[in-house]
């Protein structure tokens, strides 16, 4: 019993530095508690962007200072990452863990390449 995780290959962040994507997993069991982690891979360095554990049927709760927000619907998680700048461009990987009840299952997506373009500063206007 394998757990497959699907996510889009590419997402372009908005001019306000917001990127959203769906992380979908094929659950091999009847999990009631799921943990979702977003990992960023850039230049062979891996950093944890955010993580949330949620009960099936309930909302995801990220820490107050997290740059992520999200909603869940069945085996689908809608993730939004805010405050992105050009330097944050990279591969964002969705890791899903079925925490309860046992057995535990792990699933890792192939990653979503998020491109962030810093907006051009507005030119001073002379009136």
């Amino acid at each position: 019993k394998a757990m497959h995780v699907a996510q889009p290959a590419v997402v372009l962040a908005s001019s306000r530095g917001i990127a959203s994507f769906v992380c979908e997993y094929a659950s091999p069991g009847k999990a009631t508690e799921v943990r979702v982690t977003v990992l960023r891979q850039a230049d062979s360095q891996v950093t944890e962007v955010c993580a949330a554990t949620y009960m099936m049927g309930n909302e995801l709760t990220f820490l107050d200072d997290s740059i992520c927000t999200g909603t869940s619907s069945g085996n689908q998680v809608n993730l939004t990452i805010q405050g992105l700048r050009a330097m944050d461009t990279g591969l964002y990987i969705c890791k899903v863990e079925l925490m309860y009840p046992p057995p535990y299952y792990l699933g890792i997506g192939n990653g979503t390449q998020i491109y962030v373009i810093d907006p051009e500063p507005c030119p001073d206007s002379d009136f």
Epitope: K1, A2, H4, L39, V46, E48, P102, P103, Y104, L106
Partner: antibody
Framework: QVQLVESGGGVVQPGRSLRLSCAAS????????MHWVRQAPGKGLEWVAV????????HYADSVEGRFTLSRDNSKNTLYLQMNSLRAEDTAVYYC????????????WGQGTLVTVSS | EIVLTQSPGTLSLSPGERATLSCRAS???????LAWYQQKPGQAPRLLIY???SRATGIPDRFSGSGSGTDFTLTISRLEPEDFAVYYC?????????FGPGTKVDIK
């Protein structure tokens, strides 16, 4: 740097209890799955148990379920394995190990502590 | 429970030779969630490979992993004197996390 140091091993009679400790430094326990793996003398490796992230979820091998209990003290960054109703077949070196970023492979291990169950 | 079988049980080779170790799973190991460890007498195991083919930090490039599904291989391209040890594979796609029985690489 990451370091794991186990303690609490020793000789104990069958049916008795023992508590192992694993002091972690160089990282925060709650960011990782923390595992115990054991190795009987001259034998291979056997996964024993894991305590996940916030400490609410714990999973155990069938061979220790109901007898062993995992806990954690975040203020001391220390992991504990309470072993009750010990049997001769629990005799082993017990290793504390940290789960990796990409899953439950074990990227850092302690030096191990020997538990001998004998009358 | 996923049962891992390793072969051969013992591999007798000389320094400089190539070592090929096999790990077979009783059922498919999802997304190649397989790791390899090296253990020397009196020491804790050391992570060599995770994700079937990714080398752990500080591991020399003479160690390489390959495979998917149920068949995995650890290759040591040229054995150094310090490579003679016992090697274990482990799956971590689902609990209980299981190890193979090990392959001992000793000096011929």
């Amino acid at each position: 740097q990451v370091q794991l140091v186990e303690s609490g091993g020793g000789v104990v009679q069958p049916g008795r209890s023992l508590r192992l400790s694993c002091a972690a430094s160089g990282f925060t326990l709650s960011n990782y799955g923390m595992h115990w793996v054991r190795q009987a003398p001259g034998k291979g490796l056997e996964w024993v148990a894991v305590i996940w992230y916030d400490g609410r979820n714990k999973h155990y091998a069938d061979s220790v379920e109901g007898r062993f209990t995992l806990s954690r003290d975040n203020s001391k960054n220390t992991l504990y394995l309470q072993m009750n109703s010990l049997r001769a077949e629990d005799t082993a070196v017990y290793y504390c190990a940290r789960g990796g970023v990409w899953g439950s492979y074990f990227d850092y291990w302690g030096q191990g502590t020997l538990v001998t169950v004998s009358s | 429970e996923i049962v891992l079988t390793q072969s051969p049980g013992t591999l007798s080779l000389s320094p400089g030779e190539r070592a090929t170790l096999s790990c077979r799973a009783s059922q498919s190991v999802s997304s190649s969630y397989l790791a390899w460890y090296q253990q020397k007498p009196g020491q804790a195991p050391r992570l060599l490979i995770y994700g079937a083919s990714s080398r752990a930090t500080g591991i020399p490039d003479r160690f390489s992993g390959s495979g998917s599904g149920t068949d995995f291989t650890l290759t040591i391209s040229r054995l150094e004197p310090e490579d003679f040890a016992v090697y274990y594979c482990q799956q971590y796609g689902s609990s209980p996390f299981t190890f193979g029985p090990g392959t001992k690489v000793d000096i011929k």
